[in-house]
């Protein structure tokens, strides 16, 4: 007996589709060998129609595919637009030839069953409504009109013109006439369910002179759309339910046995398993909306359904749309840490992957916010200025070509904890989610800058030093000047690296930056950081204030300039939250607060590359003028 298993008999009707699953034993060879589907001829020959090597016969062109699921030890043959010519004997199998391991499948495609010749067929989706047209002769105008549903023995009343209504149609069925036309009546049935499918008879009058019409009502469950996504990538469920449910709450749920568990809805419900990686976005007033899930996991695979109902929960008789999501474990998206840990006052460097084929795409970093339907306002991007409340402590370093960009956030507080998304204006599958956890610091930071009260005097020389521990000895140290376009690395040489590597004196490890002579443009945030090649590590930040020399004093040291900078920053946070509220007032904002900006620059990625120094790790540009001498003391 064959170790391959599948359905021995498959029966369907013309125009429909089949999805045949074949099961194979769990071995590495089986998972990787060729899979095929062939048709057996009278001679015993089996002619390949489709195989996993990419072969597709002419008769299957545009209507069939074969998908291998190595993690389930199955492969699936999907065939659409069936005709009676597809009836026959087939084999699904494994091996380089069609004489390998195989399983016999018989496929029978029948004609669509014949109905009485005068039958009118109405085909509707679940949850929709149907209006059945019932013509009659003028002499039956005064008579009773009715619609009944055929059962085995009788015809069960649905509704009649005397306002009798079957209990299962109360509130759903209406019998009416239009205008002055006395030759047609109509029956509208709303919130259709599977149980409404069947044969109906509408009738006007009684006895032999009655007008009758046969109606076949077909109520279809939506065919699930198949979605194939990579592990760690993202998926968007585009749900279009129609104008009639535009004002109802929307939901996405996942089938679980006989229930459908809501994952997210527009009433604020959200499954904790999707915290930080899901958004629901109302698209327009026509009942369209979308749900975006990032950071796909193996366990996210399954049968999803979207719908609309005032409760935000699935209800029978309301329109739905369905998908079958498959998550491919052989992913092109690199496996990165999904949780990054930092401490208060410290910093984190987050490596964001992007499709290496799209190195010129614009890169962004946004913070996922779960309130309402969820949204992800952009905090920084290659052409998006840093949000004001992140001034001096957030920068994006683009490293063109290597499939990674880095986002650095320093001066961490516990309020920074949360979920962040890496995204580009290119391949949307590469959206990834990072959870940032911030713990209270229990020790001194690794990098410390002196002096901490950094006020430089115009025209004079000013030096700041960055102390680092021996564990950073072999790493590259750098200073950069922060602007809301990035942190421009200043050229420096670290003389500490020339010392004997045998010993390391904790107290003397420092890299200094000197401004000589100090100018007004030097005022601002500076970062001291470490990195190894293109991999960024810790950073610390200092605000350098620039003041004019006061008479009678060669050096003024006012109260902590950084404290002043921080006060200003807190004021900015208040302002920015106000402007964000204004932003939220825009009708139907997208999931990203700066989405319009992303879309607008989307097509200009080539022409408008960020100008060299905005976050360029190796650009020696404008702030490296001759007045800056960087040396180690």
């Amino acid at each position: 007996k064959s170790p391959i298993f599948g359905p021995q008999e498959v029966s369907s009707i013309e125009g429909d589709s089949v999805s045949i699953t074949c099961y194979y034993p769990d071995t590495s060879v089986n998972r990787h060998t060729r899979k095929y589907w062939c048709r057996q001829g009278a001679s015993g020959m089996c002619t390949t129609l489709i195989s996993s090597n990419g072969y597709l016969s002419k008769e299957y062109s545009g209507r069939a595919n074969l998908i291998n699921f190595p993690e389930n030890n199955t492969f699936v043959i999907n065939i659409e637009q069936l005709t009676q010519d597809d009836t026959g004997s087939y084999k699904c199998g494994l091996g380089t030839s069609n004489r390998g391991l195989s399983f016999d499948v018989s496929l029978e495609v029948s004609q669509v069953p014949e109905l009485p010749s005068d039958t009118h067929v109405y085909t509707k989706d679940i949850g929709r409504n149907v209006t059945i047209e019932c013509p009659f002769k003028r002499e039956n105008a005064p008579s009773k009109k009715s619609l009944c549903k055929k059962t085995n023995q009788s015809c069960e009343l649905v509704i009649d013109s005397t306002e009798k209504v079957n209990p299962s149609y109360i509130g759903r069925a209406k019998l009416f006439m239009k205008g002055t036309d006395l030759t047609v009546f109509y029956v509208n049935i709303s919130h259709l369910t599977h149980n409404d499918a069947g044969l109906y008879i509408c009738q006007a009058g009684e006895g032999p002179s009655a007008d009758k019409k046969n109606v076949d009502l077909q109520v279809l469950a939506p065919e699930p759309e198949l979605l194939y996504k990579d592990l760690r990538s993202s998926v968007t469920f585009e749900c279009d339910l129609g104008r009639e449910v535009a004002n109802e709450a929307k939901y996405l749920c996942r089938m679980n046995k006989e229930t459908c568990d809501v994952i997210i809805n527009t009433l604020g419900k959200r499954d904790p398993d999707f915290e930080g990686r899901i958004l629901i976005t109302p698209k327009d007033d026509n009942g369209r909306f979308s749900v975006l899930i990032t950071g796909l996991r193996k366990e996210d695979a399954g049968h999803y359904q979207c719908g609309a109902h005032s409760s935000g929960l699935p209800q029978e008789g309301w329109p739905i749309q369905t998908w079958q999501l498959f998550v491919n474990e052989e992913s092109t998206i690199p496996n990165r840490r999904s949780v990054v840990k930092g401490v208060t006052g410290g910093s984190v460097a987050i490596a964001c992957p992007y499709n290496p084929k799209e190195s010129s795409s614009l890169k962004y970093w946004c913070r996922w916010e779960g309130d309402g339907n969820g949204h992800c306002p952009v905090l920084v991007g290659t052409q998006a200025q840093v949000q004001e409340e992140y001034e001096g402590r957030l920068a994006l370093f683009d490293q063109p070509g290597n499939g990674t960009y880095t986002v650095i956030l320093n001066q961490l507080t516990t309020e920074d904890a949360g979920f962040y998304w890496c995204l580009t204006n290119g391949d949307s599958r590469w959206r990834t989610t990072i959870e940032l956890q911030v713990a209270e610091a229990t020790r001194e930071p690794n990098l410390e800058v002196t002096p901490q009260n950094a006020t430089a005097v115009l025209g004079e020389t000013f030096t700041v030093s960055c102390h680092y521990p021996c564990k950073f000895y072999s790493q590259e140290k750098y200073w950069c000047k922060w602007s809301n376009k990035g942190c421009h690395i200043l050229p420096s040489h670290d003389e500490g690296a020339r010392q004997s590597s045998v010993s390391c004196d904790q107290s003397s490890q420092l890299v200094s930056m000197t401004l000589n002579p100090v100018s007004k443009e030097d005022e601002g945030w500076y970062w001291c950081g470490v990195k190894q090649g293109q991999t960024y590590g810790e950073t610390t930040a200092i605000y350098i204030a620039v003041e004019e020399r006061t008479r009678g004093s060669s050096h003024v040291n006012p109260t902590d300039a950084n404290a002043r900078a921080k006060v200003a920053l807190e004021e900015e946070v208040v302002d920015s939250s106000i402007s964000e509220k204004e932003n939220k007032a825009i009708p139907n904002p997208g999931p990203f607060a700066n989405e319009r900006e992303i879309q607008n620059v989307g097509d200009q990625a080539q022409e408008n590359r960020a100008s060299g120094d905005a976050g360029s790790a190796d650009g020696q540009s404008r702030s490296s003028s001759s007045k800056h001498h960087h040396h180690h003391h």
Partner: nanobody, 126 residues
Framework: EVQLVESGGGLVQAGDSLRLSCAAS????????MGWFRQAPGKEREFVTT??????????YYADSVKGRFTISRDNAKNTAYLQMNSLKPDDTAVYYC?????????????????WGQGTQVTVSS
């Protein structure tokens, strides 16, 4: 919940036929497949046959031991599955269980089924 009730079991001679019925009630619209398993005394429950459906399309799966002798069918309107057993052998003696599933990854695996009937005894004497 879905309730399943089997009927049609009994004592027959080898070579005879028997027809089992499995009537489903409750939230049957959520079911996607119905099948039959059997369990002989002292043995594990084994797969016999399953029918799954999607719209007008039906898929029928059979164990090698019953292929060509047993036929599964269903009446959608009655929410009932049938097992027509021909050319019965003494080896077919067992309690036959009806099972229903909302999602089936592998029809041969009993744990894939969500609902089970109480079982009906089939005895084939030689």
């Amino acid at each position: 919940e879905v309730q399943l009730v089997e009927s049609g079991g009994g004592l027959v001679q080898a070579g005879d036929s028997l027809r089992l019925s499995c009537a489903a009630s409750g939230r049957t619209r959520t079911t996607y497949g119905m099948g039959w398993f059997r369990q002989a005394p002292g043995k594990e429950r084994e797969f016999v046959t399953t029918i799954t459906w999607s719209g007008p399309t039906n898929y029928k799966y059979y164990a090698d031991s019953v292929k060509g002798r047993f036929t599964i069918s269903r009446d959608n309107a009655k929410n009932t599955a049938y097992l027509q057993m021909n050319s019965l052998k003494p080896d077919d003696t067992a309690v036959y269980y009806c099972a229903a599933s909302t999602v089936l990854t592998d029809p041969r695996v009993p744990t894939e089924y969500d609902y089970w009937g109480q079982g009906t005894q089939v005895t084939v004497s030689s």
